[in-house]
């Protein structure tokens, strides 16, 4: 057992049919040494006296809200959750596979620069009775500050039957160095509640690896006299980090017919324009990557090609 | 070229051949997303490799202050993985493919090692572990972590040059 | 006059390489997607490959060892043929595309590759 | 890659018929293919693309329809000058591919 956060610990059991459990000794927060009575939840059951309570904890409901009371007088609470081990691996039931980029990815990153800022995102079917808590730091063994804020419910989705919701927090690296060449990763740690079950989540990446830019910004089209062709101009994302000249980008241009079965045009370029051959409902899309290190391509930012 | 003094390097030839690193340093190892190497407890294998610091300098405004700093931290990191990927870690067993990019890419850093220091010049460089791994597949996985971090280092010194030919050219 | 000239052909060597032209007159070549096509000696039209802006497809038996590229301020088309074998022997024509390359508007007269030791 | 199955391979017809050939692809194409006519020694002529669209200056006769896998180009009315062999075209997003080829001959 440990202790979450004050007066809330967890209880960590192997969970496998006929399990022993696991021996708990509540004690309760107060001076007082004798007529201590404790209840769980909102039972008036007494479940022991003396001012402490030892438990046999083996299933949810041996979880839950201790209390102890002198006279009818509330003294103090301790909040079990369990977390389940299963073939000594520990539950992931909360949050659902992300499956990208690979299995068991339950949290997703992105940073849109190399300022030390980075958004990371999770998902579930759970609607109620569900917390989380965000911890990050950089480097394990001696970490170094990145500050978290309240994850919050970003988007609900419904996929056939269930409703999928979507959960994200910022983070900020307290002294970045966006020039320098990572060796630490930076470590992000989820704590997921849901009633009385409690689980961990953790993902370890590099700022470099999570870098996804913007799309190109202020897309242009201007037609080039007696020809079909196009010259396509296009300007770095606001988010991107400064200098240009340091933190440069390159782009990738496509000219896509209406349908997805029609060959695309692609032209790659580190520059900011580029020259296209246009043709009746086709549309123009430019997306940007990072220029020396092959992170995520950006979102397309597009226009008509008339 | 950075010779002693301090004069400034060729910044254009080495931006051009800082930029062929990471387009060889990414075909040489392209599937890095797929495979993270930090599970494998690598830290005894390649943590000892030089890193471009927070306070090397190879910053915009410490590149504009003093690029001789950054330059000799770029060139110690060149020679040490020149001298890896010259090592029996990428010429023993398993062989190479004949195409591997890994050739071209040990003497493009040979040639950008040059560029910033001539003969007769020699900046102190950083002495290389013995990395010695006896299994085929010991070796196979340390090649994919030098090349990881190959990338993340010549990422760093293409940003230097780019940078430094764009505003730091005479 | 709008027109398209195809140069190059001629006897080849198994094995042998060969590069053909195809020069565009009267209309600006870069505007357009081209493409190569050929016909065996009393067989059906061929697909070879195409080219866009700069984004090139081939036929699955042409990726390897022919290649399509284009040089606009010659306003010239070229298809570069390496490896040859017997099965090449063809006429091959370039072609515009109207919209992308299914739709060819505009072909060369054809230039005749022999493929022959 | 698709296929584009072209029937029939010969066809003898006489002046003022009523000519039909079908182009059939092994997956659905939409609206990409065209219709070419060629004459012996000569290069190929665009008569039909996006299936049913005349290209200018061929005469009405001609006509094309379908959408996706089945494909067909009509002659109204058989000329002297249509004695030639024609061949659909078809692409999707990474191939394009002829059909084997029509022979129209004189009955």
């Known amino acids: 057992i440990w202790e979450l956060k004050k007066d809330v610990y967890v209880v960590e059991l192997d969970w496998y049919p006929d399990a022993p459990g696991e021996m708990v000794v509540l004690t309760c927060d107060t001076p007082e040494e004798d007529g201590i009575t404790w209840t769980l939840d909102q039972s008036s059951e007494v479940l022991g006296s003396g001012k402490t309570l030892t438990i046999q904890v083996k299933e949810f409901g041996d979880a839950g809200q201790y209390t102890c009371h002198k006279g009818g007088e509330v003294l103090s609470h301790s909040l079990l959750l369990l977390h389940k081990k299963e073939d000594g691996i520990w539950s992931t039931d909360i949050l659902k596979d992300q499956k990208e980029p690979k299995n068991k990815t339950f949290l997703r990153c992105e940073a849109k620069n190399y300022s030390g800022r980075f958004t990371c995102w999770w998902l579930t079917t759970i609607s109620t009775d569900l917390t989380f808590s965000v911890k990050s730091s950089r480097g394990s063994s001696d970490p170094q500050g990145v500050t978290c804020g309240a994850a919050t419910l970003s988007a609900e989705r419904v996929r056939g039957d269930n409703k999928e919701y979507e959960y994200s927090v910022e983070c900020q690296e307290d002294s970045a160095c966006p020039a320098a060449e990572e060796s630490l990763p930076i470590e992000v740690m989820v704590d997921a509640v849901h009633k009385l079950k409690y689980e961990n989540y953790t993902s370890s990446f590099f700022i470099r690896d999570i870098i996804k830019p913007d799309p190109p910004k202020n897309l242009q089209l201007k037609p080039l006299k007696n020809s079909r062709q196009v010259e396509v101009s296009w300007e770095y994302p606001d988010t991107w980090s400064t200098p240009h000249s340091y933190f440069s980008l390159t782009f990738c241009v496509q000219v896509q017919g209406k349908s997805k079965r029609e060959k695309k045009d692609r032209v790659f370029t580190d520059k900011t324009s580029a020259t296209v051959i246009c043709r009746k409902n086709a549309s123009i899309s430019v997306r940007a990557q990072d220029r020396y290190y092959s992170s995520s391509w950006s979102e397309w930012a597009s226009v008509p090609c008339s | 070229r950075a010779v002693p003094g301090g004069s400034s390097p060729a910044w254009t030839q080495c931006q051009q051949l800082s930029q062929k690193l990471c387009t060889l340093a990414w075909s040489a190892h392209p599937l890095v997303g797929h495979m993270d190497l930090r599970e494998e407890g690598d830290e005894e294998t390649t943590n000892d490799v030089p890193h471009i610091q927070c306070g090397d300098g190879c910053d915009p405004q410490g590149l504009r202050d003093n690029s001789q700093f950054c330059l000799q931290r770029i060139h110690q990191g060149l020679i040490f993985y020149e001298k890896l990927l010259g090592s029996d870690i990428f010429t023993g067993e398993p062989s190479l493919l004949p195409d591997s990019p890994v050739g071209q890419l040990h003497a493009s850093l040979l040639g950008l090692s040059q560029l910033l220091q001539p003969e007769g010049h020699h900046w102190e460089t950083q002495q290389i572990p013995s990395l010695s791994p006896s299994q085929p597949w010991q070796r196979l996985l340390l090649r994919f972590k030098i090349l990881r971090s190959l990338q993340a280092f010549v990422a760093v010194a293409a940003r230097v040059f780019a940078h430094g030919a764009a505003t730091l050219s005479p | 006059e709008v027109q398209l000239v195809e140069s190059g052909g001629g006897l080849v060597q198994p094995g042998g390489s060969l590069r053909l032209s195809c020069t565009a007159s009267g209309f600006s070549l870069s505007s357009y997607w081209m493409t190569w096509v050929r016909q065996a000696p009393g067989k059906g039209l061929e697909w070879v490959g195409t080219?866009?802006?700069?984004?090139?497809y081939y036929a699955s038996w042409a990726k390897g060892r022919f290649t399509i590229s284009r040089d606009n301020s010659k306003n010239t088309l070229y298809l570069q043929m390496n490896s040859l074998r017997a099965e090449d022997t063809a006429v091959y024509y370039c072609a515009r595309g109207l919209t992308t390359d299914y739709d060819l508007d505009l072909w060369g007269q054809g230039t005749l590759v022999t493929v022959s030791s | 890659d698709i296929q584009l199955t072209q029937s029939p391979s010969f066809l003898s017809a006489s002046v003022g018929d009523r000519v039909t050939i079908t182009c059939q692809a092994s997956?659905?194409?939409?609206?990409?293919l065209a219709w070419y006519q060629q004459k012996p020694g000569k290069a190929p002529k665009l008569l039909i693309y996006?299936?049913?669209t005349l290209t200018s200056g061929v005469p009405s006769r001609f006509s094309g329809s379908g959408s996706g896998t089945e494909f067909t180009l009509t002659i109204s009315s058989l000329q002297p000058e249509d004695f030639a062999t024609y061949y659909c075209?078809?692409?999707?997003?990474?191939?394009?591919?002829f059909g084997g080829g029509t022979k129209v001959e004189i009955k």
């Open positions: 080219i866009a802006t700069s984004s090139t």
């Open positions: 997956e659905d194409i939409e609206s990409y």
């Open positions: 075209l078809g692409a999707d997003d990474t191939t394009t591919v």
């Open positions: 996006s299936a049913s």
